[in-house]
């Protein structure tokens, strides 16, 4: 006899960095017929839905006013039908943007490089944090930890037109609080086109992911689906 | 912006009931998920029982029977009527929003609350 029922899938929308102050909206999906929803956060009970008329609903949808540090961490969701309740979801990390202060990012030799160079980015940040992030736009936004009290280097290696595109770095004062992001780096390789095939392509993030997180800094609308999956997450951990 | 006081606290005996209230201010009321929290001298912050907007309610374990929560959005009120009052139930219980919410959405986390009220006394003692 089946003692537990399947996982529900959890996600952010829009995004999983949220801006501080900003809102974000949690969503769980489980199965039709689920009387109740729990999310929990950090181990302990956050929030309870309980879907009406609940054979009609399979998602439910926690919505975050005022994102804060307090709420940034690790988010998983349960949910029962009858009696029985689900396994956990996996882990959600809500992370929150916007923190203290802005780094500086610069790259080595130059933003116009030629195929097969070495480049290196550098993030830099004056204030306590020994943990940075460099993030790549586009649809395979490619996200690198690097560690140093004040800078952090990022060696990309020989790179090859794949490595074309805008970079941006985060400070990150643990896990789940990040700093403003930088300013925009555009990285612009020249070389033989035919190289690129071989570039193999990390698909962390959707291919509008940056879009959105720039869109609720600015605006702090809600996109009413899903463009996070909980698998890119594996970055955090 | 949301105010909420509290009143209705005071001197109990064990056994005795109370009826908590917390007045809200501003139009958001309608749309704001609620909350009872306490807080014991020495210790911290506590859930005690919420309400959504559509009136699904939750309630910590050591309370669950003899306190009932209730919204009136008419008056903009929340309510905690409190019976089969014990010593420990002393405390200082504050009222929280989160504001704004979907409709089915229950808060037991002290975190996700975004407006709060300055407390009122709960005193158990014979």
């Known amino acids: 006899q089946q003692q537990t029922l399947p996982k529900p899938f959890i996600w952010a929308e829009p995004h999983f960095m949220v801006p501080k102050e900003k809102q974000v909206t949690i969503c769980c999906q489980g199965n039709y017929g689920a009387v109740e929803y729990q999310l929990h956060f950090e181990g302990s009970l956050f929030a309870v839905d309980r879907p009406k008329p609940p054979e009609r609903i399979n998602k439910v949808k926690f919505y975050i006013p005022d994102m804060n540090s307090r709420m940034a961490g690790q988010y998983s969701c349960i949910y029962r039908v009858g009696e029985l309740w689900s396994e956990p979801s996996n882990l959600l990390d809500l992370v929150v943007t916007e923190m203290y202060d802005t780094p500086t990012l610069s790259v080595h030799p130059g933003p116009e490089v030629i195929s097969g160079e070495k480049v290196t980015f550098y993030c830099r940040l004056d204030t306590a944090t020994s943990m940075f992030l460099l993030l790549k736009e586009g649809r395979s936004s490619h996200v690198q930890r690097g560690y140093g009290k004040v800078q952090a280097e990022f060696p990309l290696g020989p790179v090859t037109t794949a490595h074309r595109g805008t970079y941006r770095c985060f400070g990150s004062y643990n896990n789940h609080a990040w700093s403003f992001p930088s300013e925009p780096v555009k990285l612009l390789v020249t070389g033989d086109i035919e190289n690129t095939s071989l570039a193999p392509e990390d698909p962390t993030f959707p291919a509008d992911t940056w879009g959105t997180y720039l869109l609720t800094t600015e605006t702090g609308l809600q996109k009413d689906h899903a463009l996070w999956d909980h698998t890119a997450q594996n970055l955090l951990r | 912006e949301v105010q909420l006081v509290e009143s209705g606290g005071g001197e109990v005996q064990p056994g005795g009931s109370l009826r908590l209230s917390c007045a809200a201010s501003?139009?958001?009321?309608?749309?704001?998920?609620m909350g009872w929290f306490r807080q014991a001298p020495g210790k911290e912050r506590e859930f005690v029982a919420a309400?959504?907007?559509?009136?699904?309610?939750y309630y910590a374990e050591s309370v669950k029977g003899r306190f009932t929560i209730s919204r009136d959005n008419a008056k903009n009120t929340l309510y905690l009527q409190m019976s089969s009052l014990r010593a420990e139930d002393t405390a200082v219980y504050y009222c929280a929003a989160v504001v704004p919410t979907y409709g089915n959405n229950i808060y037991v986390h002290s975190a996700a609350y975004n407006y709060w009220g300055q407390g009122t006394l709960v005193t158990v003692k014979p």
């Open positions: 309400i959504s907007r559509s009136d699904d309610t």
């Open positions: 501003g139009r958001t009321f309608a749309s704001a998920a």
